[in-house]
C-alpha cells in the first residue's frame, strides 16, 4: 500500500467512521431492545 500522507489521514478517518457506525448500530439495537422489554 502507498505511504501517501493524504491517504494515511483519510484511512484513519474512515476507520473512525466505521467504528462510530458500528457503535451506533450496537447502541441502537440495545435501545430498541430496552424499549421492547418495557
Amino acid at each position: 500500500h502507498s505511504d501517501g500522507i493524504f491517504t494515511d489521514s483519510y484511512s484513519r478517518y474512515r476507520k473512525q467512521m466505521a467504528v462510530k457506525k458500528y457503535l451506533a448500530a450496537v447502541l441502537g439495537k440495545r435501545y430498541k431492545q430496552r424499549v421492547k422489554n418495557k
Epitope: 500500500h1 502507498s2 501517501g4 494515511d8 483519510y10
Partner: antibody, heavy 118, light 110 residues
C-alpha cells in the same frame, strides 16, 4: 520512468465539456490519492479536487457540481470531466500524486492548457 | 473550506539574504501544511511537508516551522536558483476542509 502525463486540453466554448486524462507510468496509481490543481494564466495555484485510493472524491467549491474526478485502475489513468465550462475555468490543469511520508516526494504532470472562449 | 493567506505577495531580495514567507490558515490545521516552489512554465515542486519536514533532495537552507494557524517558510541564505514563486497548501481533513493553496509569494531579485 515514474511520471504523469496529462492530455485532453484545448479550446472549448462556454457551456461546453472536456475530459482531461492523467496517465501514470512507473507506479500503480491505484495505491495513491491523486489531485487535480489548476493555474489560470499569470495567477496562483488552485486546488480542484481529489480522488482517494478507494475512489472517494472531494471537490473545491468552484468545481462542485460541474467537475467529476474518476479513475480507471486497469488503464492506470485518472480523469477530470469538466462540464458547463466558463471563461474563468481557463487554466493549465495539473494532476499530481499525493506526497509520500517515506519516499518524501511528490509527482506532478507537465500540465495541459484548457481555454474556454467563444 | 479552510482559507490560506500568504504574505508578502512579492518579496525583493539579494543572493545571501535570509528570506521568510508566512502562511496563515483561517482555522487550526495542526501541522498539515505543504510548501511548494514553482518556476515559470513548470509544475510545482514539493519543498516541505508536515509543516517542517524537508522533502527528499531539498537543500537544508530551506526550513519550515509553525503549527495551528501560523506557518513560516525560511530560506537561510538565498541562492540564484531560489528566485521563484512559493505556495503553501493545507491538507488537514481534506474531506471537509478542502486543500486550498495560499496566494503565492514571488521572490524576485532586488
Amino acid at each position: 520512468e515514474v511520471q504523469l502525463v496529462e492530455s485532453g486540453g484545448g479550446l472549448v466554448q462556454p457551456g461546453g465539456s472536456l475530459r482531461l486524462s492523467c496517465a501514470a507510468s512507473g507506479f500503480s496509481l491505484s495505491s495513491y490519492a491523486m489531485i487535480w490543481v489548476r493555474q489560470a494564466p499569470g495567477k496562483g495555484l488552485e486546488w480542484v479536487g481529489i480522488i482517494y485510493d478507494n475512489g472517494d472524491t472531494y471537490y473545491a467549491s468552484s468545481a462542485k457540481g460541474r467537475f467529476t474526478i474518476s479513475r480507471d485502475n486497469s488503464k492506470n489513468t485518472v480523469y477530470l470531466q469538466m462540464n458547463s465550462l466558463r471563461a474563468e475555468d481557463t487554466a493549465v490543469y495539473f494532476c499530481a500524486r499525493e506526497p509520500g511520508s517515506t519516499t518524501q516526494n511528490d509527482l506532478w504532470g507537465q500540465g495541459t492548457l484548457v481555454t474556454v472562449s467563444s | 473550506d479552510v482559507q490560506m493567506t500568504q504574505s508578502p505577495s512579492t518579496l525583493s531580495a539579494s543572493v545571501g539574504d535570509r528570506v521568510t514567507i508566512t502562511c496563515q490558515a483561517s482555522e487550526n490545521i495542526y501541522n498539515s501544511l505543504l510548501w511548494y516552489q514553482q518556476k515559470p512554465g513548470k509544475a510545482p515542486k514539493l519543498l516541505i511537508y508536515r509543516a517542517s519536514t524537508l522533502a527528499s533532495g531539498v537543500p537544508s537552507r530551506f526550513s519550515g516551522s509553525g503549527s495551528g494557524t501560523e506557518f513560516t517558510l525560511t530560506i537561510s541564505s538565498l541562492q540564484p536558483d531560489d528566485f521563484a514563486t512559493y505556495y503553501c497548501q493545507n491538507y488537514y481533513n481534506i474531506w471537509t476542509n478542502g486543500a486550498a493553496f495560499g496566494g503565492g509569494t514571488k521572490v524576485e531579485i532586488k
